[in-house]
Amino acid sequence: VPPGEDSKDVAAPHRQPLTSSERIDKQIRYILDGISALRKETCNKSNMCESSKEALAENNLNLPKMAEKDGCFQSGFNEETCLVKIITGLLEFEVYLEYLQNRFESSEEQARAVQMSTKVLIQFLQKKAKNLDAITTPDPTTNASLLTKLQAQNQWLQDMTTHLILRSFKEFLQSSLRALRQM
């Protein structure tokens, strides 16, 4: 849970339900701040952030991405479809966030914070979407084999994968933030 959520920071009559727009927004921004710190370490450690060879690594990844059909963009916005996409996408990102856990030296705690905060965000959004049953949970066996495959890559591909996960997750959360403003 992001800092600043304790009782001294929020007036007693305004303790917000976990599904409140402000709470969800704060949670996403907290995760984005964490991603920003992780990206800084990744970019300082390798030249991945300037690399033009991203396509090579992207072939191995099936990172969640917002598309027009998901109803999260201004044109063709659909709040139910979009909310399902946001939750499904976050659930799909979890295996990639697990992969990130051993990828950082100085930001190890930050990587854990991003992972745990994402779990909390998913809970918030699932409460908000209590009437939606179209949310599919990724298959644990598939996730386990994907994780093994990612960890078996060579060093360059692992660095590139880390960079791509962080960049994609950032873009996904930014799109989610904009869409949730209309819900």
Partner: antibody, heavy 119, light 110 residues
Framework: QVQLVESGGGLVQPGGSLRLSCAAS????????MYWVRQPPGKGLEWVSA????????YYGDSVKGRFTISRDNAKNTVYLQMNSLKPEDTALYYC????????????WGQGTQVTVSS | QTVVTQEPSLSVSPGGTVTLTCGLS?????????PGWFQQTPGQAPRALIY???DRHSGVPSRFSGSISGNKAALTITGAQPEDEADYYC?????????FGGGTHLTVLG
């Protein structure tokens, strides 16, 4: 050109009801959260209510909760405010307003519709 | 209930700079409160200047800028013009609702 036209205001007795409408044009109405804001005579702005783009979520200010109901018809590009159990303190100019999606987007308000609650 | 606080009145000389602030009676203003600023002149509907802390609406002069400074949102007018004399309201998203401040009346002297 974006337009928001409020209507349905008038003079009503305390305890009475009114239904305000806001007809929208010039933008993709179904992609926007919509709001009602009011301004009592000689006073400041007060946020009244909001409805999500698809109409699935509604939000109310404390002073109107349980008395006012916001709704929308995306096929008609219209947002409504059903006001029941009206009180003299509900007397105000009522504006409807669209939310914002993108950087540099214009913000539009209608000219408002006057609601007067008096016996 | 959390109250959104603003200075009741401020004044500025033409060409001068003035900063209006918007705070919470309890806690700090953050980006998640989506601070917005509105200008209203007598007999006119409000006009939005800034949304989401520092994004200027289309057609709003660049002399208007928004920020979060310390624990408050702020609207700065750099190079104030006589036509800037008006009431200015800030709005903050709190939980699931929006609250307006009581407004600041800005006088442009001279």
């Amino acid at each position: 050109q974006v337009q928001l036209v409020e209507s349905g205001g008038g003079l009503v007795q305390p305890g009475g009801s009114l239904r305000l409408s806001c007809a929208a044009s010039g933008f993709t109405f179904s992609s926007y959260r919509m709001y009602w804001v009011r301004q009592p005579p000689g006073k400041g702005l007060e946020w009244v209510s909001a409805i999500s783009a698809g109409g699935g979520s509604t939000y109310y200010g404390d002073s109107v909760k349980g008395r006012f109901t916001i709704s929308r018809d995306n096929a008609k590009n219209t947002v409504y405010l059903q006001m029941n159990s009206l009180k003299p303190e509900d007397t105000a100019l009522y504006y409807c307003k669209k939310s914002t999606w993108a950087d540099g987007e214009s913000d539009y308000w209608g000219q408002g519709t006057q609601v007067t609650v008096s016996s | 209930q959390t109250v959104v606080t603003q200075e009741p009145s401020l004044s500025v000389s033409p060409g001068g700079t003035v900063t209006l602030t918007c705070g919470l009676s309890s806690g700090s203003v953050t980006a998640s409160n989506y601070p917005g600023w509105f200008q209203q002149t007598p007999g006119q509907a409000p006009r939005a200047l800034i949304y989401s802390t520092n994004d200027r609406h289309s057609g709003v002069p660049s002399r208007f800028s928004g920020s979060i400074s310390g624990n408050k949102a702020a609207l700065t007018i750099t190079g104030a013009q006589p036509e800037d004399e008006a009431d200015y309201y800030c709005a903050l998203d709190i939980g699931d609702i929006t609250e307006f401040g009581g407004g600041t009346h800005l006088t442009v002297l001279g």
